[in-house]
């Protein structure tokens, strides 16, 4: 029985050109995390394998950095990065847990209504 829950950073609105950290945390289970996949829509961004460490997809190597922890840092954001990101935790013996984060990337000139944007 899968008892775990995934907590995420929550949805994020950020400015074009900035960087953000996507993080998920698996709790309420003693299952062993064997691998974490980070995906956007149907694209694989990165894998963190318990034994083999990090692998960043070649098409994202310039703008994606591993960590902190099992999280992922996206840099030099573009409006095209807007979309849903998935952290997929492969665990034993529970199976797969998935967290979801929606990232909205805005042109810096459209900071309307006094929005507080994330540029760490």
């Amino acid at each position: 029985m899968m008892t775990g829950t995934i907590e995420t950073t929550g949805n994020i609105s950020a400015e074009k050109g900035g960087s953000i950290i996507l993080q998920c945390h698996l709790s309420s289970t003693t299952a062993q995390v064997t691998q974490v996949n980070w995906e956007q829509q149907d694209q694989l961004l990165a894998i963190c394998n318990a034994d083999l460490g990090w692998h960043i997809s070649p098409s994202f190597k310039d703008r994606v950095a591993p960590g902190p922890g099992l999280g992922l840092t996206l840099q030099s954001l573009t409006v095209n990065d807007t979309g849903e990101y998935f952290c997929i935790y492969h665990t034993y013996p529970d199976g797969t847990y998935t967290g979801r984060i929606f990232l909205e990337v805005l042109e810096s000139s459209v900071a309307e209504h006094g929005a507080r944007f994330q540029i760490p």
Epitope: N11, I12, I20, V79, T82, G83, E84, I101, H113
Partner: antibody, heavy 119, light 112 residues
Framework: EVQLQQSGPELVKPGASMKISCKAS????????MNWVKQSHGKNLEWLGL????????SYNQKFTGKATITVDKSSNTTYMELLSLTSEDSAVYYC????????????WGQGTSVTVSS | DVVMTQTPLSLPVSFGDQVSISCRSS???????????LSWYLYKPGQSPHLLIY???NRFSGVPDRFSGSGSGTDFTLKISTIKPEDLGMYYC?????????FGGGTKLEIK
């Protein structure tokens, strides 16, 4: 002036599928998410999902995965939501609503499309 | 999914009253950068819902200043001072911090 014009009411048979449209005007269409909301029994509101026209990125409420499909036609500034394999549970008013940039809220709403599923 | 619980379900008022509507979330609505995506809407039969408050406490354009929002974390409040006839209807809170976005069950503001 921001306007969202939805297609008219629909009466459809159980098991059928249908597509609702939402034509946007008065703003830069590709720069804002378009969301879809279901209102059942004139009361409960449920977020079905969204699309970002700039890159056609979508996000769905998993409760409606396989039930709703959201698409966009940038040439006509129109967003569509297709509802599949309709049952009486899908009878409701469906709204499109523009996302408020930077705040994950819904700032402008269409007039709603009433869908009745009945044999 | 995040559960949004609104209280009360029904709120009988007299014109001129001041009222508060509560919205509680099953988990914190602050994201990792400290932003909280909580908004309030008014729905009147025959109309579409419309935005009143976004980002906890920001009034949307055209919304009278008798509407105010407050709160943090999991506990949020919409206050309406000096109730007017056009304020009657269903009020909903919406969280947009976590996927999927979820609405509260609504609070019906009606005349006593």
């Amino acid at each position: 002036e921001v306007q969202l014009q939805q297609s008219g009411p629909e009466l459809v048979k159980p098991g059928a599928s249908m597509k609702i449209s939402c034509k946007a005007s008065g703003y830069s269409f590709t720069g804002y998410t378009m969301n879809w909301v279901k209102q059942s029994h004139g009361k409960n509101l449920e977020w079905l999902g969204l699309i970002f026209p700039y890159n056609s990125a979508t996000s769905y409420n998993q409760k409606f995965t396989g039930k709703a499909t959201i698409t966009v036609d940038k040439s006509s500034n129109t967003t569509y939501m297709e509802l599949l394999s309709l049952t009486s549970e899908d009878s409701a008013v469906y709204y499109c609503a523009r996302g408020l940039r930077g705040f994950f809220a819904l700032d402008y709403w269409g007039q709603g499309t009433s869908v009745t599923v009945s044999s | 999914d995040v559960v949004m619980t609104q209280t009360p379900l029904s709120l009988p008022v007299s014109f001129g009253d001041q009222v508060s509507i509560s919205c509680r979330s099953s988990q914190s609505l602050a994201n990792s950068y400290g932003n909280t995506y909580l908004s309030w809407y008014l729905y009147k039969p025959g109309q579409s819902p419309h935005l009143l408050i976004y980002g906890i406490s920001n009034r949307f354009s055209g919304v009278p200043d008798r509407f105010s929002g407050s709160g943090s974390g999991t506990d949020f409040t919409l206050k309406i001072s000096t109730i007017k006839p056009e304020d009657l209807g269903m009020y909903y809170c919406l969280q947009g911090t976590h996927q999927p976005w979820t609405f509260g069950g609504g609070t019906k503001l009606e005349i006593k």
